[in-house]
């Protein structure tokens, strides 16, 4: 029963963990202006791995995608390749780990095979862990770096009496996500790994123990794991958890005169 | 089409207090912010702030905190310029304006003219 | 604040001539993320409200005939009529849309010689 409840308790984490790397990676805001010790602009902007936004205070947003692929630093090219190899092995550690859950009978797979594939599905879910970890952390030591080389050129080069404020960018929403999402999917993995152990058939496999008592003889055959867990054939009492949530955009937009096309 | 009309010409004495109004029609009321520009008798243009009549939240510019308070009415439409405590040098010709591309002001009201003098 | 100023405080021109208004801020108002300047020029006639003219710095707005244009980047800006016509008598006004609060500048009034 533990070790079913930590195979499907390990998908679930990693699911959750899998659809957060791929939310972090879509999101745009990787970077965000940052607004303490800065004049108050009415222009907000902030980017994304795959494209910059500015929105302004009419409530107008134009986001701009990176066309160009040589032409960006090799440093996002790393976080982006680090996010999308994140989402691949996710994706097949979750395709993987579907068929190997125990609560899921499919022909007459054996146990082993689904021990394997737990294993495999586990391993699968750290390294995706561990890519978004270190993709979303590249990402994060590039802000820090920005940040304080804009924050030494804010305080040079200022002679003449024409003042250019420059833009620093400071952590986005979407590292966090990525943090987060990266750290479930790990744990994800680790609970998938440790569920393998439990599927794994043990060396010493007794068949079937005779006992002889007062000249009658009853074989006794141990039950397998799928008798005693309630899994398998009754799937009757799984709850479904359907959540969902709806954010609403506060920020101000402007007359029909210009709708942007 | 788009309009803004404001209310008539007010006359006041200093020390009372005026509220103007500018309605808005053929648009969302909610999706717009509203920015109120003064302009005094000969003068230039002076922003005085503007109301996100979503949130209800108000940005004032300097010089213009205190005795002036911007709100508005969603069911009415309609956003308030409200001045306290009134004094010779308020006035002027008050104007409310809707953002448009690059934060300019794409839709004005006719204007108000708010007179005090005792 | 951003201090707006703007060159001359009078112009009188020719009709059918060039007028070129200068405009200059105090700070860059050119936002690094779009590229964009968020300078606005207004017209504005005599007891009537102010009328857009151009946003970020040289987009006109829609029925702003195209003899209006404007151009600049960073801190100094130019409104050119290319050709005045005589409906084109008013005050212009630059205005920085970038940083709060959206100061404008003194104004220019443009006449016909």
């Known amino acids: 029963m533990a070790v079913t409840a930590c195979q499907g308790l390990g998908f679930v984490v990693s699911l959750i963990g899998i659809a957060g790397i791929i939310a972090a990676t879509c999101m745009d805001q990787w970077s965000t202006q940052d607004l303490y010790n800065n004049p108050v602009t009415a222009v907000f902007n902030y980017q994304g791995l795959w494209r910059s936004c500015v929105r302004e205070s009419s409530g107008f947003t134009e986001c701009r995608g990176y066309f160009t692929l040589l032409g960006l630093p090799a440093m996002l090219q790393a976080v982006r390749a680090l996010m999308i190899v994140g989402i691949v092995l996710g994706a097949i550690g979750l395709l993987v780990s579907i068929f190997a859950l125990k609560c899921i009978r499919i022909g007459s797979m054996e146990d082993s095979a689904k021990a394997n594939m737990t294993l495999t599905s586990g391993i699968m879910f750290i390294v995706s862990g561990l890519c978004a970890i270190a993709g979303v952390s590249v990402f994060a030591n590039m802000l820090v770096t920005n940040f304080w080389m804009s924050t030494a050129n804010m305080y040079t080069g200022m002679g003449g009496m024409v003042q250019t404020v420059q833009t620093r960018y400071t952590f986005g929403a979407a590292l966090f996500v990525g943090w987060v999402a990266g750290g479930l999917t790990l744990i994800g993995g680790v609970m998938m790994c440790i569920a393998c152990r439990g599927l794994a058939p043990e060396e010493t496999n007794y068949k079937a123990v005779s006992y002889h008592a007062s000249g009658h003889s009853v074989a006794y055959k141990p039950g397998g794991f799928k008798a005693s867990t309630g899994f398998g054939s009754n799937t009757k009492n799984k709850k479904i958890y359907d959540g969902g949530a709806r954010t609403e955009d506060e920020v101000q937009s402007y007359p029909s005169k210009h709708d942007y096309v | 089409q788009i309009q803004l009309v404001q209310s008539g010409s007010e006359l006041k004495k200093p020390g009372e207090s005026v509220k103007v109004s500018c309605k808005a029609s053929g648009y969302t009321f909610t999706n717009y912010g509203m920015n109120w520009v003064r302009q005094a008798p000969g003068q230039g243009l002076e922003w005085m702030g503007w109301?996100?009549?979503?949130?209800?939240?108000?940005t004032y510019a300097d010089g213009f905190t205190g005795r002036f308070v911007f709100s508005s009415d969603t069911s009415a439409r309609t956003a308030y310029l409200q001045i306290s405590s009134l004094k010779a040098e308020d006035t002027a010709v008050y104007f409310c304006?809707?953002?448009?591309?690059?934060?300019?002001?794409?839709?004005w009201g006719q204007g108000t003219l708010v007179t005090v003098s005792s | 604040d951003i201090v707006m100023t703007q060159s001359p405080d009078f112009l009188a021109v020719s009709l059918g001539e060039r007028a070129t208004i200068n405009c200059k801020s105090s700070?860059?108002?050119?936002?690094?993320?779009?590229?964009?300047?968020?300078l606005t020029w207004y017209q504005q006639k005599p007891g009537q409200p102010p009328k857009l003219l151009i946003y970020?710095?040289?987009t006109r707005d829609s029925g702003v005939p195209d003899r209006f244009s404007g151009s600049g980047s960073g801190t100094d800006f130019t409104l050119t009529i290319s050709s005045l016509q005589a409906e084109d008598v008013a005050v212009y006004y630059c205005?920085?849309?970038?940083?709060?609060?959206?100061?404008f500048g003194p104004g220019t009034k443009v006449d016909i010689k």
């Open positions: 700070q860059s108002l050119l936002n690094s993320g779009n590229q964009k300047n968020y």
């Open positions: 109301i996100n009549t979503y949130t209800g939240e108000s």
């Open positions: 205005q920085n849309a970038y940083f709060y609060p959206f100061t």
């Open positions: 304006a809707t953002l448009g591309y690059g934060n300019s002001l794409a839709y």
């Open positions: 970020w710095a040289s």
